[in-house]
């Protein structure tokens, strides 16, 4: 909401989830692993690369169906702490200009700090608009204070807010799972908010920096490296 | 309340095309995703797809060489084509409003479909 | 495609028994879940949504729980007007119905 078409392949980490129609965003993060949100699960999901306009083939695709979807833990539906989400995709992604993994952050998040948001989510704040290119937004990261003030006893220290108190711009269904990027690190993941770009009610998402050492040790948990002794 | 009542032949010849309409009344058909759902006699419920007002699509992939399905926001209307049909495709067919969105999670879900139209008998024969 | 195994097909209660149905999916579908009750005649009227919520409107009678791969709808105390066929419906992938279980009066 209150964005602007990203330009084209510009976001080369954006991945869109599939299950027949575009449900959930996503980032990845290496060549065969996408990170997105807990509560964008399902049995089975197609992951679609390179996407700009998802309604139309434009020739930069890759499309790679889920071999693993694996869920944080302790993700909790109700409360959507720990929100986060990992995939593994059947065949690594061929990595290129137009599709390339994001870094993990290496630090938290700080306020102030610009940050781009992408995703095909709805652009109205009030009613539906599904767009079919990719959307970006600029915002910056708030405060802790701001985000607990906006949202209180329910933002954990897993969550954080980007945004405009004023409202006017932000995240909304469809962005779910997709990419806060500040600084050329993947530091949050759209989870969810009280409608989308109203007043006082700035986007919530999942703080990567507290899963960093999750998506490590998952990833190697579930990469098959033969050893020969 | 926002109502749906299904429109078309009610009899159509084998290999043929059966076309319904579906209009919304009582609403905008704006900003819904909107359903086809057949059932044939006596049997249970059969989903066919799903049109956004944007046009966008979601078939079952057992219909889909033979679904198309359109939307005109100006008639607050959505209609369904099913190709190449036979006996097998004798139903009621029902249209129906997806219900979207009620939590305050990101993603894009579907929460079931919460008005349907009182559905129209299809008969395939020649 | 996710298949939906309903169970029972058919069942036979009297007014102010307790009636549970099951539903069970081929896959995990989390909590993907809907249940419908189809009147004679009539359109399907959705009861709950997401495994567990009920749909505005529907009396508090009717219920749903579970998660995954297994799903249970009761009706606490049956009432003569609750004489229909019930139907889950998953929308994990795509959109599947179970067989329906179709409820009489003892």
């Known amino acids: 909401v209150g964005g602007y078409i990203c330009e084209e392949n510009s976001v080369p980490y954006q991945v869109s989830l599939n299950s027949g129609y575009h449900f959930c965003g996503g980032s990845l993060i290496s060549e065969q692993w996408v990170v997105s949100a807990g509560h964008c699960y399902k049995s089975r999901i197609q992951v679609r690369l390179g996407e700009h306009n998802i309604e139309v083939l434009e020739g930069n695709e890759q499309f790679i169906n889920a071999a693993k979807i694996i869920r944080h833990p302790k993700y909790n539906s109700r409360t959507l702490d720990n929100d986060i989400l990992l995939i593994k995709l059947s065949s690594p992604a061929v990595i290129n200009s137009r599709v390339s993994a994001i870094s993990l952050p290496t630090a938290p998040p700080a306020a102030g700090t610009e940050s781009l948001i992408s995703g095909w989510g709805n652009t109205l704040s009030s009613g539906a608009d599904y767009p079919d290119e990719l959307q970006c937004l600029d915002a910056p990261v708030l405060s802790q204070a701001e985000c607990e003030a906006s949202y209180p006893g329910k933002i954990t220290n897993n969550m954080f807010c980007v945004g405009f108190l004023e409202g006017g711009k932000d995240s909304c269904q469809g962005d779910a799972g997709g990419p806060v990027v500040s600084n050329g690190e993947l530091q949050g993941i759209v989870s969810w908010g009280y409608g989308c770009a109203q007043k006082n009610r700035p986007g919530v998402y999942t703080k990567v920096y507290n899963y960093v050492d999750w998506i490590k040790d998952t990833i190697a948990a579930n990469s098959h490296h033969h050893h020969h002794h | 309340q926002v109502q749906l009542q299904e429109s078309g032949p009610g009899l159509v010849k084998p290999s043929e095309t059966l076309s319904l309409t579906c209009t919304v009344s009582?609403?905008?058909?704006?900003?819904?995703?909107w359903s086809w759902i057949r059932q044939p006699a006596g049997k249970g419920l059969e989903w066919i797809g799903r049109i956004y007002t944007s046009g966008s699509t979601n078939y079952n992939p057992s219909l889909k060489s033979r679904v198309t399905m359109s939307v005109d926001t100006s008639k607050n209307q959505f209609s369904l084509k099913l190709s190449s049909v036979t006996a097998a495709d004798t139903a009621v067919y029902y249209c129906?409003?997806?219900?979207?969105?009620?939590?305050?999670?990101?993603?894009?879900?579907?929460?079931?479909?919460?008005?349907w139209g009182q559905g129209t008998t299809v008969t395939v024969s020649s | 495609d996710i298949q939906m195994t309903q169970s029972p097909s058919s069942l036979s209660a009297s007014v102010g028994d307790r009636v549970t149905i099951t539903c069970q999916a081929s896959?995990?579908?989390?909590?993907?879940l809907n249940w419908y009750q189809q009147k004679p005649g009539k359109a399907p009227k959705l009861l709950i949504y997401?495994?567990?919520n009920l749909e505005t409107g529907v009396p508090s009678r009717f219920s749903g729980s579970g998660s995954g791969t297994d799903f249970t709808f009761t009706i606490s105390s049956l009432q003569p007007e609750d004489i229909a066929t019930y139907y889950c419906?998953?929308?994990?992938?795509?959109?599947?119905f179970g067989g329906g279980t179709k409820v009489e009066i003892k």
């Open positions: 129906a409003r997806d219900l979207t969105n009620y939590g305050s999670g990101k993603s894009i879900r579907f929460y079931g479909m919460d008005v």
């Open positions: 997401d495994a567990s």
């Open positions: 896959q995990d579908i989390s909590n993907y």
């Open positions: 419906q998953q929308d994990d992938n795509f959109i599947t």
């Open positions: 009582g609403g905008s058909i704006s900003s819904y995703y």
